[in-house]
């Protein structure tokens, strides 16, 4: 089924040499005495066999209905038919942007990270042998390359490289010059790859408390999608029925990071639970970061320099 | 007519990899992009990328970046997902469908049938 | 990246009412008169169909009493008279950029 027109709804520019192939291809020449027959469907029209006859910008072949060039009124329904093999497409022919060189319609947009590998080939394999030769624009202004066959651009992405790219062939039949055009948006991104997770706020935090209230130690951290937060203390984590880690909450930023918070609750604080570390720790394959939470009583704040407190 | 199969169902642990393959048939595989979108039980679609099987240019949603690799083999018209270090909220049907390739093209009309992934300690 | 809302989570209706579902695009998916905006129908263990594209385009062997319309934003697809095989859960999904977006559909049940 090589370069055969498999999706059934197809948009294409006016003034364009166009081709329908049907996906049977192979099978019809194992059966080359079988009728093979091409229709059109379109409004009040129901089901007309299409010949060289019908048109003048119309040729068959085999397995494929060219037009040189399709116009407005093509649009419709297609139909190849041959034997109890049916395949049908609905053609929709629409108007050329005048003030363009290229058709918005007509785009494929492709993102690319700057510094990664980024590509462009100008190649169409159905027409490869009536192309005399192919010209890349970018943003509709040519680009002088080398190959006028085949222009090709390969390189790391620069963010100078963002813009439109057309690949214009130019080729002949009976006379007449066409061309074909293919249009790339691209877009040149920030790297995505995963950042090195951090703990927001300093690393070391004295909170201030009074024997017998509760306090939440909230961990903050920016990290990746699978990267994992998490408490430490004490021996044993979990052996104080008092300390509760309360589920994790996350949201994802404008560049696709996540935002993690996890509060760990101590109630009813006691004695035990002063002057001891609470670590919290971000880890992804990258490493890991931790940040300490160390509780002091209210009267003894005056101790301690007030930079270090954390409320 | 145009046809996407896909590998069978699999079981993976925690932190392993696991790796389904969608074989197209009946059009010109480089012709159409091919994605991948999954489904966790009870859920949405969830939109994981895509591979351009022309060229092998890809784009993977950012919740997958880093652990999601699309490949391809022209030779057997096959596209590949690769997803690493699987955690219990991976288990979903995952699916390949395949689009045109202008952005207005890029919506399914053919899908694979769905390879379940379970992931389990 | 393009969000998709679509509503309502759940809609109770009986056969032979009309039925309204609407999707919301966090920004513009329309483009030189285009909408880039399409409708699949899931049944529970079946991969999704497609029904509607280009905002109003019917697919191939689709009932006509399913239709389409919207741009810009707001999308609304709509089936005229429900059939007992229409109840299921209905996506819409945006092409006008990558990455390729869902909403997070609607489940269309019977009252």
């Known amino acids: 089924a090589e370069s055969c027109t498999s999706r059934p709804h197809i948009t294409v520019v006016e003034g364009e040499p166009f081709y329908l192939k049907h996906c049977s291809c192979s099978l019809a020449h194992e059966i080359e005495t079988t009728t093979k027959s091409w229709y059109k469907s379109s409004g009040s029209q129901e089901h007309v066999e299409l010949n060289p006859r019908s048109s003048s910008r119309i040729a068959l072949h085999d397995c494929v209905l060219e037009f040189w060039p399709v116009e407005l009124n093509d649009t419709g329904s297609y139909f190849f038919q041959m034997k109890n093999y049916t395949q049908k497409w609905k053609l929709n022919v629409i108007r050329r942007n005048k003030h363009s060189c290229f058709t918005e319609r007509q785009v494929t947009s492709k993102i690319v990270e700057v510094k990664k590998f980024f590509q462009i080939t100008c190649e169409n394999s159905y027409y490869q042998t009536l192309v005399n030769s192919t010209s890349l624009y970018k943003n509709c202004k040519k680009l002088l390359l080398e190959n006028n066959k085949n222009p090709t651009i390969k390189k790391n992405a620069e963010f100078e490289d963002q813009g439109y790219y057309s690949c214009v062939h130019f080729l002949h039949h009976n006379g007449k010059l066409f061309n074909i055009t293919k249009t790339f948006n691209i877009t040149i991104v920030e790297d995505r790859s995963n950042i090195v997770p951090v703990l927001l706020g300093p690393k070391l935090n004295h909170v201030a408390v009074e024997l017998g209230k509760n306090v939440r130690l909230n961990c903050s951290a920016l990290l990746n999608e699978e990267d994992v937060i998490y408490w430490m203390f004490g021996e044993e984590n979990g052996s104080d029925p008092n300390i509760h880690e309360e589920k994790e909450m996350r949201i994802m930023t404008p560049e696709g990071k996540w935002h993690a918070s996890k509060v760990l609750r101590i109630e009813n604080i006691g004695e035990s639970n002063l002057n001891v570390l609470y670590n919290c720790t971000v880890a992804s394959t990258g490493g890991t970061d931790t940040k300490s939470f160390i509780l002091v009583r209210k009267a003894d704040m005056a101790d301690i320099p007030g930079h270090v407190f954390t409320r | 007519q145009v046809q996407l199969v896909q590998s069978g169902a699999e079981v993976k642990k925690p932190g392993a990899s696991v790796k389904v393959s969608c074989k197209a048939s009946?059009?010109?595989?480089?012709?159409?992009?091919m994605h991948w979108v999954r489904q966790a039980p009870g859920q949405g679609l969830e939109w994981m990328g895509t591979?351009?099987?022309?060229?092998?240019?890809?784009y993977y949603a950012q919740k997958f970046q880093g652990r999601v690799t699309m490949t391809r083999d022209t030779s057997i018209s096959t596209a590949y997902m690769e997803l690493s270090r699987l955690r219990s909220d991976d288990t979903a049907v995952y699916y390949c469908?395949?689009?045109?390739?202008?952005?207005?093209?890029?919506?399914?009309?053919?899908w694979g049938q769905g390879t379940t992934v379970t992931v389990s300690s | 990246e393009i969000v998709l809302t679509q509503s309502p989570g759940t809609l109770s209706l009986s056969p032979g009412e009309r039925a309204t579902l609407s999707c919301r695009a966090s920004?513009?998916?329309?483009?030189?008169?285009?909408?880039?905006m399409h409708w699949y129908q899931q049944k529970p263990g079946q991969a999704p169909r497609l029904l509607i594209y280009?905002?109003?385009n019917l697919e191939t062997g689709i009932p006509d009493r399913f239709s389409g319309s919207g741009s810009g934003t707001d999308f609304t697809l709509t089936i005229s008279r429900l059939e007992p095989e229409d109840f299921a859960v209905y996506y819409c999904?945006?092409?006008?950029?990558?990455?390729?977006?869902f909403g997070q559909g609607t489940k269309l049940e019977i009252k």
């Open positions: 469908t395949t689009s045109g390739d202008y952005d207005a093209d890029r919506y399914f009309d053919v």
């Open positions: 009946g059009y010109t595989f480089t012709s159409n992009w």
């Open positions: 591979i351009d099987p022309s060229d092998s240019y890809t």
């Open positions: 920004k513009s998916v329309s483009t030189s008169g285009d909408s880039y």
């Open positions: 280009l905002a109003s």
């Open positions: 999904q945006q092409s006008r950029e990558l990455p390729l977006s």
